[in-house]
Interface confidence: medium
């Protein structure tokens, strides 16, 4: 396996409707044709798998029909949106990016991006 | 059942060319990388080529590279290698041969499912 | 292009002999590595993959194991159907490439 660097923001805000975006970016080495691209959350050391996606070069990332992740990909960026957050969600949600096909297989792991989520408060009671 | 059957293969002379067909049944063909692997008489085993699902990405051998073409036509689960400028070395049996599966989260290249093989024969 | 090296290049044995066959990849391919075995005038047939991961249908008494450069494959119990050549195979990178087989017969 060998490494391959990925890029991604260091911090965002999710808007108040819970939805978070940001940008997955991977040097590649050579022509890739399949990529997969994992999203993990890290919290409190510990680190859980969000989403995945596996896409050829060119065509829509495509996540599975209950998954909170979407995506699109242009050249060796992911663009990708969570959706579905709440303050809980707060943490540093990390890009891995594998290059599946051809051989060699390359690995990328981003150095995550701190998605702060702040829970709307409810609308105070109206009087009219 | 899961099957390959190669065809076209023949007596042609040096310079000349040749269409190698193989046809896939019992598998969603489309979701597989295919490849192209020759054997010459009582020698080992060379690959030759390869194509990707949807067929964007090609890959070749030196030895064959700017001569042979490898193509798929998925609607009807069929591998092809266009083969030109055929020198007596490309005499072999050729097999064609099942490779990855998109979107497999273990990365891995193994040829599971093979032909019985086509055989060329290059001569004057 | 990473060259294998198979040893030996054949051998004989009797039934129900441990025989063993190495790979050397000339470069580190981590354990990116298939076995095949190929009866006279048929298609060679996937035996291991990933090194050492038994296909499935396959019998145990073969095996694999190796990592990096060196790759061994094992018949633990020869028996008369075993009588074929047998190859590894690098999926590292591409050009994808064989050992020069190693043909097994029986004493």
């Known amino acids: 396996c060998k490494a391959m660097h990925v890029a991604q923001p260091a911090v965002v805000l999710a808007s108040s409707r819970g939805i978070a975006s940001f940008v997955c970016e991977y040097a590649s080495p050579g022509k890739a044709t399949e990529v997969r691209v994992t999203v993990l959350r890290q919290a409190d050391s510990q680190v859980t798998e969000v989403c995945a996606a596996t896409y050829m070069m060119g065509n829509e990332l495509t996540f599975l029909d209950d998954s909170i992740c979407t995506g699109t990909s242009s050249g060796n960026q992911v663009n990708l949106t969570i959706q579905g957050l709440r303050a809980m969600d707060t943490g540093l949600y990390i890009c891995k990016v594998e290059l599946m096909y051809p051989p060699p297989y390359y690995l990328g792991i981003g150095n995550g991006t701190q998605i702060y989520v702040i829970d709307p408060e409810p609308c105070p009671d109206s009087d009219f | 059942e899961v099957q390959l059957v190669e065809s076209g293969g023949g007596l042609v002379q040096p310079g000349g060319s040749l269409r190698l067909s193989c046809a896939a049944s019992?598998?969603?063909?489309?979701?597989?990388?295919m490849h192209w692997v020759r054997q010459a008489p009582g020698k080992g085993l060379e690959w030759v080529s390869a194509i990707t699902w949807s067929g964007r990405g090609t890959y070749y051998a030196d030895s064959v590279k700017g001569r042979f073409t490898i193509s798929r036509d998925n609607s009807k689960n069929t591998l092809y290698l266009q083969m030109n400028s055929l020198r007596a070395e490309d005499t072999a049996v050729y097999y064609c041969?099942?490779?990855?599966?998109?979107?497999?989260?273990?990365?891995?290249?193994?040829?599971?499912?093979w032909g019985q093989g086509t055989l060329v024969t290059v001569s004057s | 292009d990473i060259q294998m090296t198979q040893s030996p290049s054949s051998l004989s044995a009797s039934v129900g002999d441990r025989v063993t066959i190495t790979c050397q990849a000339s470069?580190?391919?981590?354990?990116?590595l298939n076995w095949y075995q190929q009866k006279p005038g048929k298609a060679p047939k996937l035996l291991i993959y990933?090194?050492?991961n038994l296909e499935t249908g396959v019998p145990s008494r073969f095996s694999g194991s190796g990592s990096g450069t060196d790759f061994t494959f094992i018949i633990s119990s020869l028996q008369p159907e075993d009588i074929a050549t047998y190859y590894c195979?690098?999926?590292?990178?591409?050009?994808?490439?064989f050992g020069q087989g190693t043909k097994v017969e029986i004493k």
């Open positions: 041969a099942r490779g990855r599966l998109f979107g497999l989260a273990l990365y891995g290249e193994a040829f599971d499912v």
């Open positions: 470069k580190d391919i981590s354990n990116y």
């Open positions: 195979q690098q999926f590292n990178s591409f050009p994808l490439t």
């Open positions: 990933d090194a050492s």
């Open positions: 019992g598998f969603t063909f489309s979701s597989y990388v």
